[in-house]
Amino acid sequence: QLPPGKPEIFKCRSPNKETFTCWWRPGTDGGLPTNYSLTYHREGETLMHECPDYITGGPNSCHFGKQYTSMWRTYVMMVNATNQMGSSFSDELYVDVTYIVQPDPPLELTVEVKQPEDRKPYLWMKWSPPTLIDLKTGWFTLLYEIRLKPEKAAEWETHFAGQQTEFKILSLHPGQKYLVQVRCKPDHGYWSAWSPATFIQIPSDFIMNDHHHHHH
């Protein structure tokens, strides 16, 4: 029987910069029941606080609700693991909420086949940013990525759309049914999950184009 091994806070995420959750990985348990506590202080403070919510994020987590979350202050946190034989501490972790945002997927993905008379046909798609993300404040830049594939294909074709919320693709296989998805990330954050798949049937008379794709 031994003191617990050193835990590690390995992940922190915020859906919208208004709340966030951090997760830790326990070290070895030393063969005894182990209690974990997360303590933190914010930059400029000396007063240590204990995690406000160990429940919401699931096992080995700490959730910071709205009243505990500040974008203006760096959080300095560590996890203490304790059993009957002793204690061990994780390394200190520094968290700036701006840099841990993982948004929800983009919304309202619509996909259409456009066949203008004077030009080659193309696939046109548009979407909206996730509702929880406030883009009006200016500091939040979302980047988008699209993936699509014929229904029965194994490989996805991926396109980076930058900050655009619409996109054209010119090279597709006629007669095929395609799945299309989109995801987003803040410049210094994490990719969202992919949006639910939207299906589109490419007409049999769709003319393949030499050029691959371009932004709108």
């Epitope: 590690e8 390995f10 974008m71 203006w72 520094y94 840099y99 200016g138």
Partner: antibody, heavy 118, light 112 residues
Framework: EVQLVQSGAEVKKPGSSVKVSCKAS????????IHWVRQAPGQGLEWIGE????????NYNQKFKGRATLTVDKSSSTAYMELSSLRSEDTAVYYC???????????WGQGTLVTVSS | DVVMTQTPLSLSVTPGQPASISCRSS???????????LHWYLQKPGQSPQLLIY???NRFSGVPDRFSGSGSGTDFTLKISRVEAEDVGVYFC?????????FGGGTKVEIK
Amino acid sequence: EVQLVQSGAEVKKPGSSVKVSCKASGYTFTSYWIHWVRQAPGQGLEWIGEIDPSDSYTNYNQKFKGRATLTVDKSSSTAYMELSSLRSEDTAVYYCGRSFFTNWFAYWGQGTLVTVSS
Amino acid sequence: DVVMTQTPLSLSVTPGQPASISCRSSQSLVHSNGNTYLHWYLQKPGQSPQLLIYKVSNRFSGVPDRFSGSGSGTDFTLKISRVEAEDVGVYFCSQSTHVPFTFGGGTKVEIK
């Protein structure tokens, strides 16, 4: 203990490429961005770019875009910085650095001296 | 790119005496999220840089309280209240508000 251990010194010819490695240990490699910075002899520090090891997303200093390539190998917890079309002005010590969940970095590798000389 | 200008270039200080280094940026370092990402590093002879101060005034873990940072907007200062022999090296300011991140040219601190 967090450690970033870099590959050894290199001597390269002008026009060639160099690939510097940075092996991370003591933490979950995919959790934090890796930055690359260089320091020419007797000079200041110059930021080359950064990579998120979880998905290989990169941000580059425009000055190095097209010439520097940042990659990671998750299986070995190693980050790489490759610089192509080397010229004598690229002679420098190249450092990798690790951030927290922040945009500043607190852990640095020991540095790799790259000498470009004909 | 944001240009970071440090003064003085070098500083010779008697142990126990204070020292002050100035750093000026060519544009405001206030991020659109309200934070100011101005940091100070020390590079001791033959070593890699080490973080002293993050976000203007916050001492990093293990940094002695004789080091303090202050400033706002474009003008920043690092102060050492009582210089010790182990403080010798080159001090760099750095900004990570704007990409590319940039560094000052450095201030060499020596002991008299």
